[in-house]
Every structure is written in structure tokens, then in C-alpha cells.
Interface confidence: medium
């Protein structure tokens, strides 16, 4: 009688993560008597996957009923496949022995490859805000995919970026892989509404790439421009001075009025107007009682924006031309908030 052969007809099997893998194996004879075992890998370190003789293998089911007489189909199904299951599986026939069964013949092996989807890309920007014209770095990470081949692209507002570096790890064979990419982006004053997008394409995604986004509003700081102007006199001895704070982002801003270097009033930007580009404008004004001054007054609008060092703009107020009003020692009226802010 012809010697038993163990036939594994599939050289390779490709399965998506979470699905069931079928590993086929048949024997050409019932003789010699003895069980079939399945292993992952070869050699001394091989891992037992299924033993027909004994043991508990909750993820493994046999394709046919192995208790049926004359059964020679020893195919198995492995459920809930993960990338960690990838490897070469061998169907091995043992000859019944005492006390131990003896390995008789092995199949040629079936390589199980697992297709696993990449995780949703996570895009992270710099820890601190940066101002326009500066170059900032964004990172994109995605994990757990297999096979290794993957494509990553960067976009800013739909325009593809070219200044980036990408690594897929590990370099050698692995059950699953990770991708890490760093892109450099030059900020402009118009970037408050801008988005940076990392797009990952993989065979498991069937042409529908995964995207991760970062809003540049989290990254950019647009410093304000200041303009201090003197408005027409509201009363015979009063002058209205405004400080226009324009094109700033984010909104966090504190303004201090100084009269000849002395703090007159401090306020925080609350109700602001938003520009189309996402930056903000704000105006503060000060009523100066010129009759309280014998000399010219230097008015300074000092702005501290988003925790940065203060910037300021000054205005020299000429008071010699105005008559002095006796009995008044008030240099400036601290007006109500809705008077002081001009919208």
C-alpha cells in the first residue's frame, strides 16, 4: 500500500482580521494509525494549534467530523483571526506509539497572512502656538495594519503637501505594522480656518482612505496690530482716544491704558468682532479730561495677547490749547463697559 501523504493544498491563505481562517489538510491513507496535530511554525519552538487527541482549543473547529470512520479530512477553522495569528501552519500526522505518539509526516505548510485595517490616523501638532511665517511640524500615526504596504499623504486645505517624512515600523517581518509621519507646514495669517489632513490608504480599506485632521486654529497665534487715534472732542474739556486692536487670534487678550506711564484702566477683550479669516478685532476707548492736565499727556495702549510679552502703541495728547477747568482733578473718566467698547 502506498505510504501516507499529508496534503496541504493551499500554499497561502489571506484572511481579514476578525474573520475565520480555513486551513485545509487531507491524508491519503488511514495508515499508520494515529492522530493529526496542527502547529504554527516548525522546529522545537513550534506552537501547538490543535491536537486531535486531547486538549482544549476554543478558537479551533474541525471542518469534518473526525470521529467518523474513514475520515481523512483534517482541515481546521480558526475563528476571530488577529494579526498575531499570521504565520505558517503545518498539518502533522503522528503514528500511534507508547508511551508517546511519534511524528510521522508533515504537510508542506500553509502561510496564513492577515489583512488588518490601520487604526484611525491621529494627527498632533506642536505643543506651543506659533506665529505666521514660522514652520511647524505635525505628526500622524496609525497602527495595527497588515500587510506592510501603505500610502500616506498630507494635505493643507485640500492642497497636497510635499515636505514630510514617513516611516513604517518595524522594518522586518511582523504580524502588524505602524506608520509615523512628520509634515512641515508654514503658517500664514490666514490659517485660523485652515486644516491639516493626514490620509492613509491601505488594501483593507477598499479605496476609502482613513483621514485624521488637525485644525490650525489650535496651532496658530496671530499677533494683533494696534492703532491709537484721537477722536473729535465730545465735550469742551474731554478728548476721546481709541485703541483699535486688529487681526488677532486667539481671542485671549488684555488691554491696559497708561497715562504718562501710570495705569489708568485694564480690561479684557470680551465682545469682539470676527473677521472672515477667523481673526478678531476689538476697540477700546478712553475719555480724557484735559482740564486736569497742565502738560501734554502721553497715552499708551498696551496689549498682552495670549500670554505673550505686551505690545503697545502711544499717542501724545496736546493739552495746552484747552482751557483748564478749575476744581477738577480727574484725569480720565472710567466709563461703563458698553460705552468704552465701540462695536
Amino acid at each position: 500500500e502506498e505510504e501516507l501523504q499529508v496534503i496541504q493544498p493551499d500554499k497561502s491563505v489571506l484572511v481579514a482580521a476578525g474573520e475565520t481562517a480555513t486551513l485545509r489538510c487531507t491524508a491519503t491513507s488511514l495508515i499508520p494509525v494515529g492522530p493529526i496535530q496542527w502547529f504554527r511554525g516548525a522546529g522545537p519552538g513550534r506552537e501547538l494549534i490543535y491536537n486531535q487527541k486531547e486538549g482544549h482549543f476554543p478558537r479551533v473547529t474541525t471542518v469534518s467530523d473526525l470521529t467518523k470512520r474513514n475520515n481523512m479530512d483534517f482541515s481546521i477553522r480558526i475563528g476571530n483571526i488577529t494579526p498575531a495569528d499570521a504565520g505558517t501552519y503545518y498539518c502533522v500526522k503522528f503514528r500511534k506509539g507508547s508511551p508517546d505518539d511519534v511524528e510521522f509526516k508533515s504537510g508542506a505548510g500553509t502561510e496564513l497572512s492577515v489583512r488588518a485595517k490601520p487604526s484611525a490616523p491621529v494627527v498632533s501638532g506642536p505643543a506651543a502656538r506659533a506665529t505666521p511665517q514660522h514652520t511647524v511640524s505635525f505628526t500622524c500615526e496609525s497602527h495595527g495594519f497588515s500587510p506592510r504596504d501603505i500610502t500616506l499623504k498630507w494635505f493643507k486645505n485640500g492642497n497636497e503637501l510635499s515636505d514630510f517624512q514617513t516611516n513604517v515600523d518595524p522594518v522586518g517581518e511582523s504580524v502588524s505594522y505602524s506608520i509615523h509621519s512628520t509634515a512641515k507646514v508654514v503658517l500664514t495669517r490666514e490659517d485660523v480656518h485652515s486644516q491639516v489632513i493626514c490620509e492613509v490608504a491601505h488594501v483593507t480599506l477598499q479605496g476609502d482612505p482613513l483621514r485624521g485632521t488637525a485644525n490650525l486654529s489650535e496651532t496658530i497665534r496671530v499677533p494683533p496690530t494696534l492703532e491709537v487715534t484721537q477722536q473729535p472732542v465730545r465735550a469742551e474739556n474731554q478728548v476721546n482716544v481709541t485703541c483699535q486692536v486688529r487681526k488677532f487670534y486667539p481671542q485671549r487678550l488684555q488691554l491696559t491704558w497708561l497715562e504718562n506711564g501710570n495705569v489708568s484702566r485694564t480690561e479684557t477683550a470680551s465682545t469682539v468682532t470676527e473677521n472672515k479669516d477667523g481673526t478678531y478685532n476689538w476697540m477700546s476707548w478712553l475719555l480724557v479730561n484735559v482740564s486736569a492736565h497742565r502738560d501734554d499727556v502721553k497715552l499708551t495702549c498696551q496689549v498682552e495677547h495670549d500670554g505673550q510679552p505686551a505690545v503697545s502703541k502711544s499717542h501724545d495728547l496736546k493739552v495746552s490749547a484747552h482751557p483748564k477747568e478749575q476744581g477738577s482733578n480727574t484725569a480720565a473718566e472710567n466709563t461703563g463697559s458698553n460705552e468704552r467698547n465701540i462695536y
Epitope: 470512520r69 506509539g97 508511551p99
Partner: antibody, heavy 126, light 105 residues
């Protein structure tokens, strides 16, 4: 189905015996055949079986001393037992398997017997 | 090894279950011997198959590595030694259990 054993009797220790089972009433070549024995006052003990492809199995007590063979033309199965011991004394039954081949990757000759002979007595004594 | 109880007893008409613990992957046979040295009779082979000449009150089943012979409506004539046969779970060698003596009270 009829199974007739022969060849028993008084045997001397260290000697050899040859038991023959003549089968009739079924297609002999299609079925596994075996031998089971029972020592005085003891239970049943598997001795040997021969399967469809002439693959043989032997019980632990006779391993290395027994040879089972079959002649499909004569519808006979033979058990040769060498180096006889006193503990080989007992009644030897010929047994027919319910089928051919194996299941579960194993041919368990004791789980699928569907017919028995009446037995032949073997006494090993000096 | 194949393990079965040494003895069981029952009143006529009762149901008797005799268990046999052995291999989880193999099948089981059940054999009745009325007297020592007499030819055994096959009641069940391949775990649950009954020869045509055996009454239906004899049935076999298996759960995990334990097989059960069930005799419903036990009769006085059922007094005998019952052997289970299977394979040794470690060596795969074909073996018999030590036998279970059924006494009908």
C-alpha cells in the same frame, strides 16, 4: 455472521501458539478483525487487531510477542503468540469490527466490535 | 485508562445508567457478558449504534470524554457484567474497562 476459533489447548511456557479464526456470512476483506482474551476471573483484554490496509495494533501485554495476519482469500485471521507465559492463559475470542479503516485518526478495535466468536481456551502450563 | 464503576444495582423497570470515562476524541463500545468465559454480546458499537438484534431499551451516548450506556425498563435477565471498550486517552491503545456488574434487585 459466524466466527469459529481454533488452535487453543495446553501450551508450554516459552513456547508459541497459533490461533486461527474462520469467518463466514460477510465480505471478510471489507472488515477489520481482532482478538480479545479473558483470563480466569478477569475482565476482557484487547490482544490484537488487523485493519483494512493490513495495519496492525497490539495490546500492551503482548506487544513484541504477537503477530496478527489475515488471509482474505480464505477468510481467516491468525494470531501468532510467542514466548508464552502463564498469564497468557485464558479464553481467546475472535472479534469482527463493524467496519473498515479508522475514525478519529485512531483504530480503536475495542469500540466497534459487532460480532464475537465463542472462544477457544488456551492454557499455558508446564 | 478507561474507567467504569465496579457495580450498579436497580429494581426491575427502573432505568440504569452505566458510565465510562476515557478518550474525548474516540468512540465507545458496550458489551454484555452473562457469565465468565461465555461469548460477549455487543449492545452498542461506535458510541451509539445498536445491532439489529438488540432491544431499543439499550442506548448509548457520549458527552466530552464520558460515554453512557442507558438501560430503560431493566429486567432480571439484564443481570450481567457490562464492559465498555475504547482507546486509552494517552497511548491510543485499544482497551476495555474493568467491567460493571449489574444486579437486578
Amino acid at each position: 455472521v459466524t466466527l469459529d476459533e481454533s488452535g487453543g489447548g495446553l501450551q508450554t511456557p516459552g513456547g508459541a501458539l497459533s490461533l486461527v479464526c474462520k469467518a463466514s456470512g460477510f465480505t471478510f476483506s471489507s472488515f477489520n478483525m481482532g482478538w480479545v482474551r479473558q483470563a480466569p476471573g478477569k475482565g476482557l483484554e484487547f490482544v490484537a487487531a488487523i485493519y483494512s490496509g493490513n495495519s496492525a495494533e497490539y495490546g500492551a501485554a503482548v506487544q513484541g510477542r504477537a503477530t496478527i495476519s489475515r488471509d482474505n482469500g480464505q477468510s481467516t485471521v491468525r494470531l501468532q503468540l510467542n514466548n508464552l507465559r502463564a498469564e497468557d492463559t485464558g479464553i481467546y475470542f475472535c472479534a469482527k469490527d463493524a467496519g473498515s479503516g479508522c475514525y478519529s485518526g485512531v483504530c480503536a478495535g475495542t469500540s466497534s466490535i459487532d460480532a464475537w466468536g465463542h472462544g477457544t481456551e488456551v492454557i499455558v502450563s508446564s | 485508562a478507561v474507567t467504569q464503576p465496579a457495580s450498579v444495582s436497580a429494581n426491575p423497570g427502573e432505568t440504569v445508567k452505566i458510565t465510562c470515562s476515557g478518550s474525548s476524541s474516540g468512540s465507545y463500545g458496550w458489551y454484555q457478558q452473562k457469565s465468565p468465559g461465555s461469548a460477549p454480546v455487543t449492545l452498542i458499537y461506535e458510541t451509539n449504534k445498536r445491532p439489529s438484534n438488540i432491544p431499543s431499551r439499550f442506548s448509548g451516548s457520549k458527552s466530552g470524554s464520558t460515554a453512557t450506556l442507558t438501560i430503560t425498563g431493566v429486567q432480571a435477565d439484564d443481570e450481567a457484567v457490562y464492559y465498555c471498550g475504547s482507546e486509552d486517552s494517552s497511548t491510543y491503545l485499544s482497551i476495555f474497562g474493568a467491567g460493571t456488574t449489574l444486579t437486578v434487585l
